[in-house]
């Protein structure tokens, strides 16, 4: 019979993709680099089902996702169209808040403890999730 393609060890398969859930924290840019080195990318959430799947695995923790407006418009790291795609912002978000006093606004998106998305300062250390196609991860 044909050989079944599986996700690498410590990765979880879901709907044709493989997911890796961090247990440590990094700023958004470092998390993004980590995923790239694994031949993956920060998770791109495209449906309620995927949202629930990631939430169930991460639990109520601030978690970086692959959505940023560091280059101006909001963009998913894999090129998925933001404008027409799934969105799950917390009410009132994104708000590009300046009140943190760290300079600039907020340019990176993360899951909040209830799963809704928030924009935050990219250098905050949060957990993260990598995603890649089945058979593509290192």
């Amino acid at each position: 019979g044909s050989e079944r393609i599986c996700c690498p060890i410590n990765w979880v398969e879901y709907e044709g993709s493989c997911y890796w859930f961090s247990s440590s924290v990094k700023p958004w840019t470092e998390a993004d680099k980590y995923c790239q080195l694994e031949n993956a990318h920060l998770v791109v959430v495209t449906s309620w089902e995927e949202q629930r799947f990631v939430q169930q695995h991460m639990g109520p923790l601030n978690t970086w996702i692959g959505l940023t407006d560091q280059n101006g418009p909001w963009k998913w790291v894999d090129g998925t169209d933001y404008e027409t795609g799934f969105k799950n912002w917390r009410p009132g978000q994104p708000d590009d808040w300046y009140g943190h006093g760290l300079g600039g606004g907020e340019d990176c998106a993360h899951f909040t403890t209830d799963g809704h998305w928030n924009d935050d300062v990219c250098r905050r250390p949060y957990r993260w999730v990598c995603e890649t196609e089945l058979g593509k991860a290192n």
Epitope: D69, Q70, N71, G72, P73, W74, Y82, E83, K87, W89, P91, G92, Q93, P94, D95, D96, W97, Y98, G99, G103, G104, G105, D107
Partner: antibody, heavy 117, light 107 residues
Amino acid sequence: EVQLVESGGGLVKPGGSLRLSCAASGFTFSSYSMNWVRQAPGKGLEWVSSISGSSSYIYYADSVKGRFTISRDNAKNSLYLQMNSLRAEDTAVYFCARGGSRGFDPWGQGTLVTVSS
Amino acid sequence: DIQMTQSPSSLSASVGDRVTITCRASQSITSYLNWYQQKPGKAPKLLIYTASSLQSGVPSRFSGSGSGTDFTLTISSLQPEDFATYYCQQSHSFPFTFGPGTKVDIK
């Protein structure tokens, strides 16, 4: 195509009022902070006001605080600037622009406000 | 409030020249510095954001550098369409402020 189009400019007497509008298209309006910037004839750019995507945070230049009010209607993809107690020094081209800490892009074509008796 | 200054206020240059414009902030703005180009009767156009990132669609002859309080916009080889006024702007904190502008005209 991402586009911003201002309207509502015109001639008004000192002490009068005017409401500027900015119609946005081609992007998820509610996801972005929006801004008003003005330019007096022959002068440089002056930031006037900013508003966050859900109107939670609003900021004004000292020169317009208490006289101008920025607002937005995300259902209509529209940004507004209500200008009261207008002065001669408010005469300028008013631009709306999208964005925040990563710069303003795009900009509208501008609408001219002239305050004169 | 953060004050922005630019120098020179105007300069004359020829096509092919290397042009450098400087911008200084009255206090540190880390890298929250943006550069715009404006032509007469037109809206400003974003060239560079966060000090050194080239805006999509902007020619690579434009570059930005600097951090803290001192910043530079460089045009490596001036083209006819580059004659315009250039503004820097800080987006570190409110109120946002622009520099007074640098007019680049033909020598």
